[in-house]
C-alpha cells in the first residue's frame, strides 16, 4: 500500500502565447485538477477505468478571465493531489492530468465545468524515489508538475510489496519509522536542512534540501526563471533550477508522453504515440478524437487541436463535456400533479388517478365525450370536470333528482314547496321575501325592499333557482 502524490506548480499559456480557448467564460472562474492513474504503458482506451485510482483537487482561488490579456499563470488550488493505492505499485503506469475550469456564473443547474487541458504521461516510476518533475503541453497550455510514489509503512520497496517489521519485540518509538533500507531496525526519518521550504522542498538524506521542479535556491524558496531552459530535456539541476541536456542527444529521453527517442547526426528524433506530436511529443490538444464528451454526448467540430470542439449533450446532461447530470424532474414536466421519474434513458410520469399520457396531460374526466344529463352543462377546470346542473337535478352527471327544499331555504319558519321553476317559500305571518327573510312592520310596510306590487305578506314567494352546482 502507498500513496501517489502530485504537485501542480503552474498552469498557463505555453511559450507560444495565449491559448485559443474553445470556451468563453461569462463570469468568475476557478481551476481544479483531476488525476487518473492507469496501470501499464500500453495505450489504454480513454474511457478505461482509473484502475490504480483517481483524485480530484480542491477548487483554486476565484479569478476573472480577461480575454484580451490572459493571466500568465492561472491561480492554483492549494496542496498535493494524493491517490492512495492498496496493492503493489506497478512501476509502469499512465498518468492522466485534467485541468478543469468551473464557471461560477448563474447557469441553470449550478456551475458549468469545462475541460481546458488533458495531458497523459506514460512512465516508469519506482516507489520511494525522489520527486520527478515534468512540463507538459496541451494545445497552447503548459502544465508544470512533480510527482512521486511513496509506500505507507510497514510496506517498503520499489513496489511497496515488502513488509518490514522492527527486529525488537517492542514497536518503534515516537518519531521513528520501522526499517532502515537494509536492516530490520527502527530509524528516524531524515531531518531536512533547517529552513527548507515545506511546500517546495524535500529531502531523502538528513541535512539536504532538494527542490521540487520549478523551484531553486538553497532552501527552495526561489521560483525558477522560465526564460532560457524549459525547452530542454534532461536531468534536473538543483543548482540552476534548469533542465540541462545530458551528454548524448537521447540521454534522459527528451521525448515526453511515452515517445521513443532515436539519435540522428547531432540531434535526436521522437516517435510519438497517438494523440501527441511536436518535436518532443509534448503537444496534446483535446480534440474529438480524444473522446471529450461524456454520457453519450456527441463531439462536434474540433478536428484539430486549434479548433474548438463542442459537445452536444443528451437531454439528461449538461456542461461543456456533458459531465453534469441534469435533474430533469426539477423542470416539473409531469402535469396535473404527476410523479416524475428520471430513468436515465427516459423520463416517465406516474399519473394521478383520472389522468393519462406521457406527461399526464390528458384528463380522463374532461368534457370531451362526456355529457351532463337533464340539460346540465360541462365545465372543465382544476384538473377535473364538473356538471353545472339544470334546476331540480344534481349529482356527478346531473342524473340525480335534486330536492331544492332539502337545505331548508325558507327562513323564520316558512314552508318550502318544490316548483317546476324553482322552490317556493310560504312565509309565516310577519315575514316576507323570496326566502321569508324580511320581517313585516306592524303598519304593513317592510323594513327592507318593498314587496312586489300585488303581493301581500304571507303569500308564497317564488324564488327561481337557476342552477345547482355539484362539484366532484
Amino acid at each position: 500500500a502507498g500513496v501517489f502524490e502530485l504537485q501542480i506548480h503552474s498552469f498557463g499559456p505555453g511559450p507560444g502565447g495565449a491559448p485559443r480557448s474553445p470556451y468563453s467564460a461569462r463570469g468568475p472562474c476557478r481551476l481544479f485538477f483531476r488525476v487518473c492513474l492507469k496501470p501499464g504503458l500500453s495505450e489504454e482506451a480513454a474511457e478505461s477505468p482509473c484502475a490504480l485510482g483517481a483524485a480530484l483537487s480542491a477548487r483554486g482561488p476565484v479569478y476573472t478571465e480577461q480575454p484580451e490579456a490572459p493571466a500568465p499563470d492561472l491561480p492554483l488550488p492549494n496542496g498535493l493531489l494524493q491517490v492512495p493505492f492498496r496493492d503493489a505499485w506497478p512501476g509502469t503506469f499512465s498518468l492522466i492530468i485534467e485541468t478543469w475550469r468551473e464557471e461560477l456564473g448563474d447557469q441553470i443547474g449550478g456551475p458549468a465545468w469545462s475541460l481546458l487541458a488533458r495531458v497523459t504521461r506514460r512512465r516508469r516510476l519506482a516507489a520511494g524515489g525522489p520527486w520527478a518533475g515534468d512540463i507538459q503541453r496541451a494545445g497552447a497550455w503548459e502544465l508544470r508538475f512533480s510527482y512521486r510514489a511513496r509506500c505507507e509503512l510497514p510496506a517498503v520497496g520499489t513496489a511497496c510489496t515488502r513488509l518490514c517489521r522492527p527486529r525488537s519485540a517492542s514497536r518503534c518509538g515516537p518519531g521513528l519509522r520501522p526499517c532502515a533500507p537494509l536492516e530490520d531496525e527502527c530509524e528516524a526519518p531524515p531531518v531536512c536542512r533547517a529552513g527548507c521550504s515545506l511546500e517546495h522542498g524535500f529531502c531523502e538524506q538528513p541535512g539536504e534540501c532538494r527542490c521540487l521542479e520549478g523551484w531553486t535556491g538553497p532552501l527552495c524558496m526561489v521560483p525558477v526563471s522560465t526564460s532560457s531552459c524549459l525547452g530542454l530535456r534532461g536531468p534536473s539541476s538543483t543548482t540552476t533550477g534548469c533542465l540541462v541536456p545530458g551528454p548524448g542527444p537521447c540521454d534522459g529521453n527528451p521525448c515526453a508522453n511515452g515517445g521513443s527517442c532515436s539519435e540522428t547526426p547531432g540531434s535526436f528524433e521522437c516517435t510519438c504515440p497517438r494523440g501527441f506530436y511536436g518535436l518532443r511529443c509534448e503537444v496534446s490538444g483535446v480534440t474529438c478524437a480524444d473522446g471529450p464528451c461524456f454520457n453519450g454526448g456527441l463531439c462536434v467540430g474540433g478536428a484539430d487541436p486549434d479548433s474548438a470542439y463542442i459537445c452536444h449533450c443528451p437531454p439528461g446532461f449538461q456542461g461543456s463535456n456533458c459531465e453534469k447530470r441534469v435533474d430533469r424532474c426539477s423542470l416539473q414536466p409531469c402535469r396535473n400533479g404527476g410523479l416524475c421519474l428520471d430513468l436515465g434513458h427516459a423520463l416517465r410520469c406516474r399519473c394521478r388517478a383520472g389522468f393519462a399520457g406521457p406527461r399526464c396531460e390528458h384528463d380522463l374526466n374532461d368534457c370531451a365525450g362526456r355529457a351532463c344529463a337533464n340539460g346540465g352543462t360541462c365545465v372543465e377546470g382544476g384538473g377535473a370536470h364538473r356538471c353545472s346542473c339544470a334546476l331540480g337535478f344534481g349529482g356527478r352527471d346531473c342524473r340525480e333528482r335534486a330536492d331544492p327544499c332539502a337545505a331548508r331555504p325558507c327562513a323564520h319558519g316558512g314552508r318550502c314547496y318544490a316548483h317546476f321553476s324553482g322552490l317556493v317559500c310560504a312565509c309565516a305571518p310577519g315575514y316576507m321575501g323570496a326566502r321569508c327573510e324580511f320581517p313585516v312592520h306592524p303598519d304593513g310596510v317592510s323594513a327592507l325592499p318593498a314587496a312586489p306590487p300585488g303581493l301581500r305578506p304571507g303569500d308564497p314567494q317564488r324564488y327561481p333557482h337557476h342552477h345547482h352546482h355539484h362539484h366532484h
Epitope: A289, N295, G297
Partner: antibody, heavy 118, light 108 residues
Framework: QVQLQESGPGLVKPSETLSLTCTVS????????WSWIRQPPGKGLEWIGY???????NHNPSLKSRLTISLDKAKNQFSLRLSSVTAADTAVYYC????????????WGQGTMVTVSS | EIVLTQSPGTLSLSPGERATLSCRAS???????LAWYQQKPGQAPRLLIY???SRATGIPDRFTGSGSGTDFTLTISRLEPEDFAVYYC?????????FGGGTKVEIN
Amino acid sequence: QVQLQESGPGLVKPSETLSLTCTVSDDSISNYYWSWIRQPPGKGLEWIGYIFYSGTTNHNPSLKSRLTISLDKAKNQFSLRLSSVTAADTAVYYCARVFNWGFAFDIWGQGTMVTVSS
Amino acid sequence: EIVLTQSPGTLSLSPGERATLSCRASQRISRTYLAWYQQKPGQAPRLLIYGASSRATGIPDRFTGSGSGTDFTLTISRLEPEDFAVYYCQQYGTSPLTFGGGTKVEIN
C-alpha cells in the same frame, strides 16, 4: 407508444426544394433531439441532421449548404427543407427520435419515398 | 469523418446457426459510442444495441454486441427466422454521425 409520421410530396422536380414534415404523437417534442435520415433505393443509411427543442441543430457537412431543419413546438412537428435537389437526393426519408443515452435513433417513422424527377 | 466498414457484405446461414457481423472504424470510436440496427425490407431500421454492448428495450438476449476502439462485433447466437435482415452499425461519438454499409443476413 411514441409514433412518428413523415408527410410531404413524393415527387420533386430537379433544382426545386424538397420539404418534409414529421409529426410526433404521444410525446412532447421538447424532451428529445429529432433527426432526419435518408436511404437511397437499394443503398445504405445516411444521416442528414438533427434539431433540439432549444434550437440547437447539427447537419451533415455534405448537405449543410442546402439544408434547413426547423421545429414547431405548438404543432409537435419538425421539418426538413433541402434546396436545389438533384436525382441523387432520391431516397426514402425517415424521421427519427434521438435516443436519450447517446446519438443513436430509438424510434423511427415508417419513411416516405421522395423521387426527384422532371 | 469516421468511415465504418461492415463485413461480410452478405452472410448466408441457416436458422439455428450463429451469425457474427463485423464493423470496423477508420479511427477510434470514443467511449464505445456505437449502435447496431436491424432493417427488414420495406421497414424502418430498429435499434438493437447501443454503447457497443447494451441491448435496447425489448431486444432478445440472442443479440450481443462487443468491441471497442476500432473493431466491433454483433453476434446472433441462434438465428431465428425473423432475424434474416440487413444489419447496420452507426457511430455517434463524433459528428457527422455515420453508418456502415450494412451486412445482409440471408437464409442459406
